[in-house]
Interface confidence: low
């Protein structure tokens, strides 16, 4: 399955952090989303395989890596009020 | 705070190889790319290559290509850089940088390690 | 390669001035641009990322702008801790490339 953490975070303006996301069944695509009322979900970063990334609907203020087909970390760069957020990652052959 | 420590100086004839050393801590190594960049005597700077602890896995600049290797382990969290078949142009300061925010992003930096060729 | 090119290579400047450095990029590098300073005879450090991002303890003093091809960063009041050489660096494709630098000298 895909394994996000963490579950919850506050985090403090300027602050950053990393958002964790694995998957163990050998997906290729991994991709970032965020929700929010009214906008459904929209696309921040997404990999098509190791080593390959690219942006989204919405990037700014994230980064992310893929190192390995496993792992797609996110992080956050310096946190804004605007990135408060429900946050999903997810994968795909 | 992130630390990064490199290894001394290091004095190597023409033909032979080197190998420098650099030491993080103040953050998870495993997640890092480190990344080792050189600066001749006078000159600017020059990207060789990256290692993701978490994996080994490694990007080199061309120039660099089947002359230097670069490492990692976790279990020390040390990256190593490798250069061989040295000659009297790889004269320089070479540092170790991590990326932390984004993997090309070269956030902090080593102290420097001085190679110097010479014979 | 992705040639960047800064401009100038050398700049006098006194304490209280607003300085402006340029880097150029070849092609195309998006926001994807770090300054670096470095003090002789010392490492790097870096002071903004993806062209206009502060980090941590940077002092606000420092700005940077642009995106595409052109970049600048600016200094709004030189403090005597400033003079040092300035780089720019791109992160948009491999290798990684840096400016030749330029070199912020005290009048």
């Known amino acids: 399955g895909v394994t996000q953490t963490p579950k919850f975070q506050v985090l403090k303006t300027g602050q950053s952090m990393t958002l964790q996301c694995a998957q163990d069944m050998n997906h290729e695509y991994m991709s970032w989303y965020r929700q929010d009322p009214g906008m459904g979900l929209r696309l921040i970063h997404y990999s098509v395989g190791a080593g390959i990334t690219d942006q989204g609907e919405v990037p700014n203020g994230y980064n992310v890596s893929r190192s390995t087909t496993e792992d797609f970390p996110l992080r956050l760069l310096s946190a804004a009020p605007s990135q408060t957020s429900v946050y999903f990652c997810a994968s795909s052959y | 705070q992130v630390q990064l420590v490199q290894s001394g100086a290091e004095v190597k004839k023409p033909g032979s190889s080197v190998k420098v050393s650099c030491k993080a801590s103040g953050h998870d190594f495993r997640l890092t790319y480190i990344h080792w960049v050189r600066q001749a005597p006078g000159q600017g700077l020059e990207w060789m290559g990256r290692?993701?602890?978490?994996?080994?896995?490694?990007k080199y600049n061309e120039k660099f290509k089947g002359r230097v290797t670069i490492t990692a382990d976790t279990s020390t969290s040390t990256a190593y850089m490798e250069l061989s078949s040295l000659r009297s142009e790889d004269t320089a300061v070479y540092y170790c940088?991590?990326?932390?925010?984004?993997?090309?992003?070269?956030?902090?930096w080593g102290q420097g390690t001085t190679v110097t060729v010479s014979s | 390669d992705i040639q960047m090119t800064q401009s100038p290579s050398f700049l006098s400047a006194s304490v209280g001035d607003r300085v402006t450095i340029t880097c150029k990029a070849s092609?195309?590098?998006?926001?994807?641009v770090v300054w670096h300073q470095q003090k002789p005879g010392k490492a790097p450090k870096a002071l903004i990322y993806?062209?206009?991002h502060r980090y941590k303890g940077v002092p606000s003093r420092f700005s940077g702008s642009g995106s595409g091809t052109e970049f600048t960063l600016t200094i709004s009041s030189l403090q005597p801790e400033d003079f040092a050489t300035y780089f720019c660096q791109q992160f948009k494709s491999y290798p990684l490339t840096f400016g030749q630098g330029t070199k912020l000298e005290i009048k």
């Open positions: 092609q195309n590098v998006e926001d994807r």
């Open positions: 290692v993701y602890a978490g994996s080994g896995n490694t």
């Open positions: 993806s062209s206009s």
């Open positions: 940088a991590v990326s932390y925010y984004s993997y090309d992003v070269l956030d902090y």
